[in-house]
């Protein structure tokens, strides 16, 4: 069964900078990746970025840079402009559309006890939704 993993990482040098890493574990070719925060895409979440392997990327503030890391993983850099750090308590979700498998989505957040520079373990927290 395909799985999606999500890691949220706080940058050690800039406490206002976060990076979300997502990856797809399974066969098939990735046709689209959607990253959202505050919940799954289309279920209360707010879209942060869309990455298409053949057409490019699109991102919305506070996303700073969305990019492919490998054929089946992406990263999204976030810039927190506020004095407080809302990202620390936020859920980030990544949805991978894969042909012919369908869509697979998982969510993750920064662990409350995380030290800067440490990331959540890449344990998939699957939302059981395969379109």
């Amino acid at each position: 069964t395909p799985e999606v993993w999500v890691q949220v990482q706080m940058e050690a040098t800039e406490l206002s900078s976060f990076t979300v890493h997502c990856g797809f574990l399974g066969p098939g070719s990735i046709s689209l990746v959607t990253v959202s925060w505050g919940g799954p895409d289309g279920a209360g979440g707010t879209k942060l970025a869309v990455l298409h392997p053949e057409l490019g990327t699109r991102q919305w503030a506070p996303a700073r840079q969305a990019r492919w890391e490998t054929q089946s993983s992406i990263s999204l850099a976030l810039e927190d402009s506020g004095a407080s750090s809302p990202f620390a308590n936020t859920t980030f979700c990544c949805k991978f559309a894969s042909f012919p498998e369908g869509s697979w989505e998982s969510c993750g957040s920064l662990p409350p006890s995380s030290d800067p520079g440490l990331s959540a373990p890449p344990t998939p927290v699957p939302i059981l939704r395969a379109d």
Partner: nanobody, 118 residues
Amino acid sequence: EVQLVESGGGLVQPGGSLRLSCAASETYFDLYVMGWYRQAPGKDRELVATITYTGSIKYVDSVKGRFTISRGDAKNSLSLQMNSLRAEDTAVYYCNADPSGLGRKVYWGQGTMVTVSS
């Protein structure tokens, strides 16, 4: 599909300047890597310069200090300012886009001819 359309080629004397432009049809997505390649008569196509979405730039050694690559505000337009042109710069110049940065799908323009001759 992404269409790339180049413009700005022409005939110029040695030591002169030209500015090439490239416009991408796809505007919803941002293209991660864009670049210029060239192919001289009887030679293989070679890299001239590339620029990523984040502004990382690479030039082939033979054009360093003479050519400048840049992207427009929309990130989907590209230009190449060519100064101090030499006869060996004569070639067809092609705009290139690699949306993912991984080479999964690469797009090419139709090319624009640059001739450096007195």
